[in-house]
C-alpha cells in the first residue's frame, strides 16, 4: 500500500488563498446516516507535509501512547512502528502497555519497492480529535521495514480504512474501522477533507500547516459547498468505483470505458497522484499537451520527474486544462462528473524552489493496477465513505485551491447508458497471487 508514488503525499493549509470559497447551495441529498451537521472536535484533525501523507493523532495502549498515523483508504491494516528506526521519533512500546495482547502471529507485507513486517496483537486505541470512544483493535507492530517510513514525515504508523478482504495476512484480521463500528454506536461512515497547499511550503510552514479533516461517524456540512453526489462502491475490498467517461477541458477521451477501470478504479488517500492505466494515461497526456500547446514542457515533466518552475505568483494556470471524471451514479443510466483544476494536478514542491520561484511536479501518472484517485483528486473534494450504504460521496471541498476563473466542480446528472459494462471483471485466480500494494 506504500510504494512508488503511492506514498509520499502532500498536505497543506485548511483554506484556499485569498479566502476564495464557493457559496453554499441548499442540500439536495437524501438523508445521511449518522450524526449530521457539526463535528467541530474533528475538524482540522489531519496534518501533513508536502508529498508525505496526511496523518491523524491516535493513542494506543494503557497508559496511552500518542502516535501520528497516516490515513490510508487504500489498505486495511492498522500498523505502527514498534521498534527503533532512524526515521521515527517515537514508536509503540508494547511492553509498556498493560492492555496489550499478543496474537502470536506474524504479518509480512511486501510492496513493489520496500516492505514492512511485524507481529500481530490487540490493544486499546482512541483518536483524541475524534469520537470520544476507546476500542480494542488489531495492531500490527512493525518490527522491520524497508522504504516504508519517510524521513521527516512525522507519522509513525498507518491506518488502513479499507475493507477486510485486503487485510494482511488474510481477511480474518478485522480492520480498525470495523472494530470501531462493532464496539460503539458510531455509524458506519467517515469522510475526508484533504486540503492541499496549492503553493510550496517551506520547512516551518509545512510543520505548522493544517492538512484537513477526518470526520468519523458522519458528514460535516461546513467542509463542502453545493451538494453531495454519490457513486456506488462496486465491491468492498478497496473503495472501488466505476469511471464511465473522462474529459480534458470538456473533450471526451473517447475510449472504451472499460479502459478507465482496468483492472479497477479506487479512491485512495494514501496515494499522491491521479494514476491512470497506461492507455488512458497516454491519451490524457496527449490531450493535456495539446491543450497547453503554447508552451512546451520537458519530457521528464510529463513523467512526473522534472519540476517546472515559474516566477513566484506567475504560474499560468489558465493554459492547463481541467480534468473531468464521470462516475457511475446511484440511479440507473445516470452519472455525475467531478472536475479538478491544474491547481490539484500540478503538485507544489517545497525545498527546491527559491523564494523567487514556484515549482511543480505533474501529478498524473501511469499505473499498471488500474485508476487510483489519490490526493490529486481528493484535495478538490470532500469525500464521504458511506460504508453503511455502500457508496462514496463527492462534493466540492471548502478548502480546495482554485483561482478567480475556475473552481473544482461536482455536477450532474448526466445520462450515460450501459455503465455496468465499464467495470472490469478480474479473472478469478488464487488471490494470493494478486500483487500487494499498487505499483
Amino acid at each position: 500500500t506504500h510504494l512508488g508514488i503511492r506514498l509520499p503525499l502532500r498536505s497543506g493549509l485548511a483554506g484556499p488563498p485569498l479566502g476564495l470559497r464557493l457559496p453554499r447551495e441548499t442540500d439536495e441529498e437524501s438523508e445521511e446516516p449518522g450524526r449530521r451537521g457539526s463535528f467541530v472536535e474533528m475538524v482540522d484533525n489531519l496534518r501533513g507535509k508536502s508529498g508525505q501523507g496526511y496523518y491523524v493523532e491516535m493513542t494506543v495502549g494503557s497508559p496511552p501512547q500518542t502516535l501520528n498515523i497516516l490515513v490510508d483508504t487504500g489498505s486495511s491494516n492498522f500498523a505502527v512502528g514498534a521498534a527503533p528506526h532512524p526515521f521515527l521519533h517515537r514508536y509503540y512500546q508494547r511492553q509498556l502497555s498493560s492492555t496489550y495482547r499478543d496474537l502470536r502471529k506474524g504479518v509480512y507485507v511486501p510492496y513493489t519497492q520496500g516492505k514492512w513486517e511485524g507481529e500481530l496483537g490487540t490493544d486499546l486505541v482512541s483518536i483524541p480529535h475524534g469520537p470520544n470512544v476507546t476500542v480494542r483493535a488489531n495492531i500490527a507492530a512493525i518490527t522491520e521495514s524497508d522504504k516504508f517510513f519517510i524521513n521527516g514525515s512525522n507519522w509513525e504508523g498507518i491506518l488502513g480504512l479499507a475493507y477486510a478482504e485486503i487485510a494482511r495476512p488474510d481477511d480474518s484480521l478485522e480492520p480498525f474501522f470495523d472494530s470501531l463500528v462493532k464496539q460503539t454506536h458510531i455509524p458506519n461512515i467517515f469522510s475526508l477533507q484533504l486540503c492541499g497547499a496549492g503553493f510550496p511550503l517551506n520547512q516551518t510552514e509545512a510543520l505548522a500547516s493544517v492538512g484537513g479533516s477526518m470526520i468519523i461517524g458522519g458528514i460535516d456540512h461546513s467542509l463542502y459547498t453545493g451538494r453531495l453526489w454519490y457513486t456506488p462502491i462496486r465491491r468492498e475490498w478497496y473503495y472501488e468505483v466505476i469511471i464511465v467517461r473522462v474529459e480534458i477541458n470538456g473533450q471526451d477521451l473517447k475510449m472504451d470505458c472499460k479502459e478507465y477501470n482496468y483492472d479497477k478504479s479506487i479512491v485512495d488517500s494514501g496515494t499522491t497522484n491521479l494514476r491512470l492505466p497506461k492507455k488512458v494515461f497516454e491519451a490524457a497526456v496527449k490531450s493535456i499537451k495539446a491543450a497547453s500547446s503554447t508552451e512546451k514542457f520537458p519530457d521528464g515533466f510529463w513523467l512526473g520527474e522534472q519540476l517546472v518552475c515559474w516566477q513566484a505568483g506567475t504560474t499560468p494556470w489558465n493554459i492547463f486544462p481541467v480534468i473531468s471524471l464521470y462516475l457511475m451514479g446511484e440511479v440507473t443510466n445516470q452519472s455525475f462528473r467531478i472536475t479538478i483544476l491544474p491547481q490539484q494536478y500540478l503538485r507544489p514542491v517545497e525545498d527546491v524552489a527559491t523564494s523567487q520561484d514556484d515549482c511543480y511536479k505533474f501529478a498524473v501518472s501511469q499505473s499498471s493496477t488500474g485508476t487510483v484517485m489519490g490526493a490529486v483528486i481528493m484535495e478538490g473534494f470532500y469525500v464521504v465513505f458511506d460504508r453503511a450504504r455502500k457508496r462514496i460521496g463527492f462534493a466540492v471541498s471548502a478548502c480546495h485551491v482554485h483561482d478567480e476563473f475556475r473552481t473544482a466542480a461536482v455536477e450532474g446528472p448526466f445520462v450515460t447508458a450501459d455503465m455496468e459494462d465499464c467495470g472490469y471483471n478480474i479473472p478469478q485466480t488464487d488471490e494470493s497471487t494478486l500483487m500487494t500494494g499498487r505499483a
Partner: antibody, heavy 120, light 108 residues
C-alpha cells in the same frame, strides 16, 4: 545540418541596450521539438543561462536578469533575438545562442558565440 | 535553489591517463544532469545528458554515471583534444538554468 550564428554589435555603451540576433540555418525554428536559448560567459568565467523562447513566442528568463531581458522570435526569418537593457561592464561576455533539445532540457547545439564589450 | 559544485577545479593529467571529474548537487536532481566540454575560444559542446547518455558523435571514451546528488564524468584514456574545461548542468528543475563552476583538465 542545422547551424546557429549570432550577430550584432561587439561594443555597447553603458546604460544602453545590447541587441543580438541568432539566425538558424539548415532547419526550421518553428519545430515543436525545441526551445531556442541564450547563454553568456564573462571572460574567464563560467556559463550563465539568460533565457529561451519557443516558436509560439513563449519565453523563459533567468530571474536575475528578467527585468532587463527580452527574447523574441521571427519565424518568417528563422531568427530569434536578445535584448538586454541598461547594460554595465558586468554584462561584458561572450554571448552564445543555442538549441534546447533532448526533451527540451539540454543545449544540444551551439552557435560559435560573439563577444560583446560594454564600454564607453 | 539547487547549486552544482564541481571538483577538482583543475585536474592535471597526461595523455592516456584516466580522468575522473565530479559534480555534486546540493539536493537530488534524479538523473537530470548533463556534461559539456568547452575548448579555448570555442562554444561548449554537449557530451552527456540524462547523467549517462552520450550525445550524438561523442566518442565512447567519455562516460557519465551517478544519480541523485553525486555524478561523475569519466574519460577512460585522455586524448590530446580532450584537454578543456568541463561543465555540468542540472535540469531537474526547469527551465535549464543551473551550471556548475567548471573543471579544467590540463596537460601535466
Amino acid at each position: 545540418q542545422l547551424q546557429l550564428q549570432e550577430s550584432g554589435p561587439g561594443l555597447v555603451k553603458p546604460s544602453e541596450t545590447l541587441s543580438l540576433t541568432c539566425t538558424v540555418s539548415g532547419g526550421s525554428i518553428s519545430s515543436s521539438s525545441y526551445y531556442w536559448g541564450w547563454i553568456r560567459q564573462p571572460p574567464g568565467k563560467g556559463l550563465e543561462w539568460i533565457g529561451m523562447i519557443y516558436y509560439s513566442g513563449s519565453t523563459w528568463y533567468n530571474p536575475s536578469l528578467r527585468s532587463r531581458v527580452t527574447i523574441s522570435v521571427d519565424t518568417s526569418k528563422n531568427q530569434f533575438s536578445l535584448k538586454l537593457s541598461s547594460v554595465t561592464a558586468a554584462d561584458t561576455a561572450v554571448y552564445y545562442c543555442a538549441r534546447v533539445g533532448h526533451g527540451v532540457s539540454y543545449f544540444d547545439l551551439w552557435g560559435r558565440g560573439t563577444l560583446v564589450t560594454v564600454s564607453s | 535553489e539547487i547549486v552544482l559544485t564541481q571538483s577538482p577545479a583543475t585536474l592535471s593529467l597526461s595523455p592516456g591517463e584516466r580522468a575522473t571529474l565530479s559534480c555534486r548537487a546540493s539536493q537530488s536532481v534524479s538523473s537530470y544532469l548533463a556534461w559539456y566540454q568547452q575548448k579555448p575560444g570555442q562554444a561548449p559542446r554537449l557530451l552527456i545528458y540524462d547523467a549517462s547518455k552520450r550525445a550524438t558523435g561523442i566518442p565512447a571514451r567519455f562516460s557519465g554515471s551517478g544519480s541523485g546528488t553525486d555524478f561523475t564524468l569519466t574519460i577512460s584514456s585522455l586524448e590530446p583534444e580532450d584537454f578543456a574545461v568541463y561543465y555540468c548542468q542540472q535540469v531537474y528543475t526547469w527551465p535549464p538554468r543551473t551550471f556548475g563552476g567548471g573543471t579544467k583538465v590540463e596537460i601535466k
